[in-house]
Interface confidence: low
């Protein structure tokens, strides 16, 4: 599923991401834009053999199990395939665990490079939330 910007903002708000660990909803929508272009089915292979999955490009080395990544920790205790669902519940729940891990949203390279320090509220402007 490819979400619309406001559609995703509403879904993320429903799942409790607005101001989760101090990160406003705009941060999460911005991260999703530059990680996956709002596509729940996005996958990207990394040079270490791990793969990033879903709308927030969650990594199989640490967070989910795809049965394919040597030394996977599966800290979210989910199959990576769950992160590709059009229902973003699994991705949101895992993202909450990631952002609580100590580095906050710096865990997402795209957020660090494209969203951090920018007017992230623009990503939810005009949305009826």
């Amino acid at each position: 599923k490819v979400f619309g910007r406001c559609e995703l903002a509403a879904a993320m708000k429903r799942h409790g991401l607005d101001n989760y660990r101090g990160y406003s909803l705009g941060n999460w929508v911005c991260a999703a834009k530059f990680e996956s272009n709002f596509n729940t089915q996005a996958t990207n292979r990394n040079t270490d053999g791990s793969t990033d999955y879903g709308i927030l490009q969650i990594n199989s080395r640490w967070w989910c199990n795809d049965g394919r990544t040597p030394g996977s920790r599966n800290l979210c205790n989910i199959p990576c395939s769950a992160l590709l669902s059009s229902d973003i519940t699994a991705s949101v729940n895992c993202a909450k665990k990631i952002v609580s891990d100590g580095n906050g949203m710096n865990a997402w390279v795209a957020w660090r490079n494209r969203c951090k320090g920018t007017d992230v509220q623009a990503w939810i402007r005009g949305c009826r939330l």
């Epitope: 089915q41 996005a42 990207n44 053999g49 049965g67 394919r68 030394g71 395939s81 669902s85």
Partner: antibody, heavy 116, light 107 residues
Amino acid sequence: QVQLQESGAEVMKPGASVKISCKATGYTFTTYWIEWVKQRPGHGLEWIGEILPGSGSTYYNEKFKGKATFTADTSSNTAYMQLSSLTSEDSAVYYCARGDGHYCYWGQGTTLTVSS
Amino acid sequence: DIELTQSPATLSVTPGDSVSLSCRASQSISNNLHWYQQKPHESPRLLIKYASQRASGIPSRFSGSGSGTDFTLSINSVETEDFGMYFCQQSNSWPRTFGGGTKLEIK
């Protein structure tokens, strides 16, 4: 239960192309990788590559780049592998399998014979 | 690419014997090694995943061990239905690779 049903045997002429299909049932097709494996007598099993049907992401063994092309139709839960510029070296049994690192579920195999 | 070398190429045994098949990797692959059985004109069948975990429905006479570069598939008291080809496969890196196989035949 999980099943992978492959298309029937093919006899092709050198230089031609062929498209082999693999229809999946019994699981969520879009969220598991479909792997393709080649088996020739005396050459064992060779991994050709894989496709994630939901996203269209593909990864190929360097050896088969330019030879194999993977596609998937999520409306029919079917994965396809096209082999181009066929030669006698392409004569083999081709399997699809559901990828979990290991391959618990396999198709029955499609026998391809390339002969003039 | 990671090379997997299986030995012996052929093993001739009598039903009731216990046997060990070897698979050696060209570099360390942790426990990312899987074993398959294949009979003539059939698809491979997963026996053991991740070096030592029996796949669903596989009899307890099949067991796997090893880590790093050396792996063993053991069959305790071989039955007639166990004859065929056995392959190992690694999922530690891409491309996925298979061993050349061990043929288990009746003596």
